[in-house]
């Protein structure tokens, strides 16, 4: 089978500062030199793009300057970090990997990582 398998954790809990990190790993059927990684959010069967980056194997992953995502790559593994998350952003985050070059093109879609975000409690006023 020449399909591409993508693995990602089932559940991740965001930090109190609204930061969530997870690893997206893909089993490449070929030797890709150019890879595109996209994070999608699925809610009520609607899918929206959170962020995307294309990188050359061996080089760093570069998201757009205004992106809420950052990441690093190592071989067939991508370490993704999503920042600025709030409780309303809780949901399923899908890792999509595309082997862009050389031919043939391959698509790989993970099962998704459920990210739970809990807004921090506001600090009580101190009486000092």
């Amino acid at each position: 089978c020449k399909a591409m398998h993508v693995a990602q954790p089932a559940v991740v809990l965001a930090s109190s500062r609204g930061i969530a990190s997870f690893v997206c790993e893909y089993a490449s059927p070929g030797k890709a030199t150019e890879v595109r990684v996209t994070v999608l959010r699925q809610a009520d069967s609607q899918v929206t793009e959170v962020c995307a980056a294309t990188y050359m194997m061996g080089n760093e992953l570069t998201f757009l300057d205004d992106s809420i995502c950052t990441g690093t790559s190592s071989g067939n593994q991508v370490n993704l970090t999503i920042q600025g998350l709030r409780a309303m952003d809780t949901g399923l985050y899908i890792c999509k990997v595309e082997l862009m070059y050389p031919p043939p093109y391959y698509l790989g879609i993970g099962n998704g990582t459920q990210i739970y975000v809990i807004d921090p409690e506001p600090c009580p006023d101190s009486d000092f």
């Epitope: 089978c1 020449k2 399909a3 591409m4 398998h5 059927p29 150019e34 595109r36 996209t38 999608l40 899918v47 929206t48 793009e49 995307a52 294309t54 899908i94 999509k96 595309e98 862009m100 070059y101 031919p103 043939p104 093109y105 391959y106 698509l107 879609i109």
Partner: antibody, heavy 118, light 108 residues
Framework: QVQLVESGGGVVQPGRSLRLSCAAS????????MHWVRQAPGTGLEWVAV????????YYADPVKGRFTISRDNSKNTLYLQMNSLRDDDTAVYYC???????????WGQGTMVTVSS | EIVLTQSPGTLSLSPGERATLSCRAS???????LAWYQQKPGQAPRLLIY???SRATGIPDRFSGSGSGTDFTLTISRLEPEDFAVYYC?????????FGPGTKVDIK
Amino acid sequence: QVQLVESGGGVVQPGRSLRLSCAASGFTFSSYGMHWVRQAPGTGLEWVAVIWYEGRNKYYADPVKGRFTISRDNSKNTLYLQMNSLRDDDTAVYYCARAGDLGAFDIWGQGTMVTVSS
Amino acid sequence: EIVLTQSPGTLSLSPGERATLSCRASQSVSSSYLAWYQQKPGQAPRLLIYGASSRATGIPDRFSGSGSGTDFTLTISRLEPEDFAVYYCQQYGSSPFTFGPGTKVDIK
């Protein structure tokens, strides 16, 4: 709303050229791969070509390789198919289609007819 | 290249009946990358099912998809008059992207 509208079809002689256009609206064009799919009269669907995102990566079906060129202008939200050295068996309705977030072709244009005949 | 074969070529049924359409791949296809489309005469194809079993937006629940590996099925539980059309399966996991030859569902 999300829409694709093809244009540029017509009747052309074998060996000649034609350029098809596909105008996109209602979505962030540069965030999606775009395909051309054709359908000869009375037959099934045949994938023709795809162009990804910024337009750097393109792939073609064997029957059109070396004759057809897919391109896109993200500033104009438009997809193109330049068809050279046209043959009788290129006669078909040509559809543009969007590769959705999860890969399937989720939005299709209405199609434009190309007839290659002497 | 992954070759897709569909059967039967034509399915003659009456409204209200159940339709079962088959799609077979020449090599294993991940279920994540198998789609079904509906096409009516003079119209563009319409995405029905993606990922082998997920219904596209706005598709009625009488349409369902199943299968894995090399064998996939589209089921229409109770045919409505508007369901008589041609149905195509497609793999989109790798290039070249390929379609099956189609199954025509017509009125008996």
